[in-house]
């Protein structure tokens, strides 16, 4: 997260890392009590590596009564994710097991009315990913708030050029953005999930390169049809 | 640039033993698991042998045809993946593919083949 | 084992038509995980093969439009919307969904 601060500990419970052999990958966001929602370009590169989800953290060092470590029992790609567009990047991962509900790990409603967020809006996104454009990762949780971007302002030929399709959205990035290590974690509006961040290799903190989240209510049917 | 660099083919009598070697580079090789796959000359692709990371304990995988004769390993402090092929037969004959294994795809990543020729 | 039978052995088609390979397992394909491994290589003459699709349907970086992959359980399928000569080679199907891992016998789409 650029531009932002360190979240209040465990205010956000639904906030997961996604981690492969123990390092913080990706954001993640508690959607049910078995299943976290991520971006489906965060395993691209995690090749053979041990997939975990780690649920109920601040700090990704230091003991937490709350913090605790899941095996991922099955990924589930968005059947028409690829590798060279961020067209449907979306994730669900199966925790090996259902996660221990507490004030610090709860499910995060999601939105199913497929309607676009006002521009505008204030929307909350967090995450473990890089802090500063020389790549430092932070160990405490960051947020930042971020207001809405209109979709036609999005794809203007100076901005994302027409790429931001209805199932997107995109959040102002000036100075203040989300980051590389910040895919698949939440931009929640109104205390409900409304994108998942996505996981190109956009530049950051540039007004010009709004930040891209995939709009999870364009994805309801594909989330219910996996978590059923 | 993502690239694997087979070598260590070549002629060896029936019963002979040959070491293929395949040098990575351009990834962060101790992430992934590496397969090799072989093609006789004018015939089809089949897979030999697979290795996985260390993180799933270099576990290693075999076609039925290989098993007991062939042995893959890694040395992940130099990205190289190696297949030991002993009690070598005639129908060993063929080109050797070094691959790389992907998390949601299988194999995305191929060297240009190294060729072992078994014959008396 | 788990047995890939392609077919045809052989298809000659005329550039701009389409192509279709058909690709069938002996036994269920789908993983343990709920994904199906099934996926389809390009080697050209001379060359190493090339992915041009995984999990059934979906196109590898790079992979043209016009390639694409449909089917489940045991049957699956391989289009190609307008053949160009570059796509001239040879189109294997894969699984990787259960060890020992196996591939089609390949299909060689020549010019007609």
């Known amino acids: 997260i650029l531009g932002g601060r360190e979240a209040e500990a465990h205010a956000r419970p639904y906030m997961a890392s996604v981690q492969v052999n123990g390092e913080h990958l990706c954001g993640g966001v508690l959607v049910a009590e078995q299943w976290v929602l991520s971006a489906a370009h965060c395993l691209e590169d995690a090749a053979d590596g041990k997939v975990q989800v780690l649920l109920g953290a601040h700090s990704l060092s230091q003991p937490e009564p709350s913090k605790r470590l899941y095996d991922v029992l099955r990924a589930v790609p968005h059947p028409d994710s690829r590798p060279d567009t961020i067209d449907h990047d979306l994730l669900l991962l199966q925790l090996s097991e259902k996660a221990t509900l507490g004030p610090a790990v709860r499910p995060l409603p999601w939105q199913r009315v497929d309607r676009d967020v006002e521009p505008g809006t204030l929307c909350d996104v967090a995450g473990w990913g890089i802090v500063s454009h020389a790549g430092r990762r932070p160990d405490r949780l960051q947020h930042v708030l971020l207001p809405v971007l209109d979709r036609a302002t999005c794809n203007r030929r100076t901005h994302h050029d027409g790429a931001i399709t209805q199932r997107m959205m995109c959040a102002e990035s000036n100075r203040r953005d989300s980051c590389k290590g910040d895919s698949g974690g939440p931009l929640v509006c109104g205390g409900v999930l409304e994108g998942v961040v996505t996981s190109g290799s956009r530049v950051c903190g540039n007004r010009k390169k709004p930040g891209i989240y995939t709009r999870v209510a364009s994805y309801a049917a594909w989330i219910d049809s996996v978590l059923a | 640039e993502v690239q694997l660099v087979e070598s260590g083919g070549g002629l060896v009598q029936p019963k002979g033993s040959l070491k293929l070697s395949c040098a990575a580079s351009g990834f962060s090789f101790n992430t992934y698991a590496m397969n090799w796959v072989r093609q006789a000359p004018g015939k089809g692709l089949e897979w030999v042998a697979r290795i996985r990371s260390k993180s799933n304990n270099y576990a290693t995988y075999y076609a039925d045809s290989v098993k007991d004769r062939f042995t893959i390993s890694r040395d992940d402090s130099e990205s190289m993946v190696y297949l030991q092929m002993n009690n070598l037969k005639t129908e060993d004959t063929a080109m050797y593919y070094c691959v790389r294994h992907g998390y949601y795809w299988y194999f995305d990543v191929w060297g240009t083949g190294t060729t072992v020729t078994v014959s008396s | 084992d788990v047995l890939m039978t392609q077919t045809p052995l052989s298809l000659p088609v005329s550039l701009g038509d389409q192509a279709s390979i058909s690709c069938r397992s002996s036994?269920?394909?789908?993983?343990?995980?709920?994904?199906?491994?099934l996926e389809w290589y390009l080697q050209k003459p001379g060359q190493s093969p090339k992915l041009l699709i995984y999990?059934?349907?979906n196109r590898f970086s790079g992979v043209p439009d016009r390639f694409s992959g449909s089917g489940s359980g045991t049957d699956f399928t391989l289009k190609i919307s307008r053949m160009e000569a570059e796509d001239l080679g040879v189109y294997y199907c894969?699984?990787?969904?259960?060890?020992?891992?196996?591939f089609g016998g390949g299909t060689k789409l020549e010019i007609k």
């Open positions: 036994q269920s394909i789908v993983h343990s995980d709920g994904n199906t491994y």
């Open positions: 999990r059934v349907s």
């Open positions: 894969f699984q990787g969904s259960h060890v020992p891992y196996t």
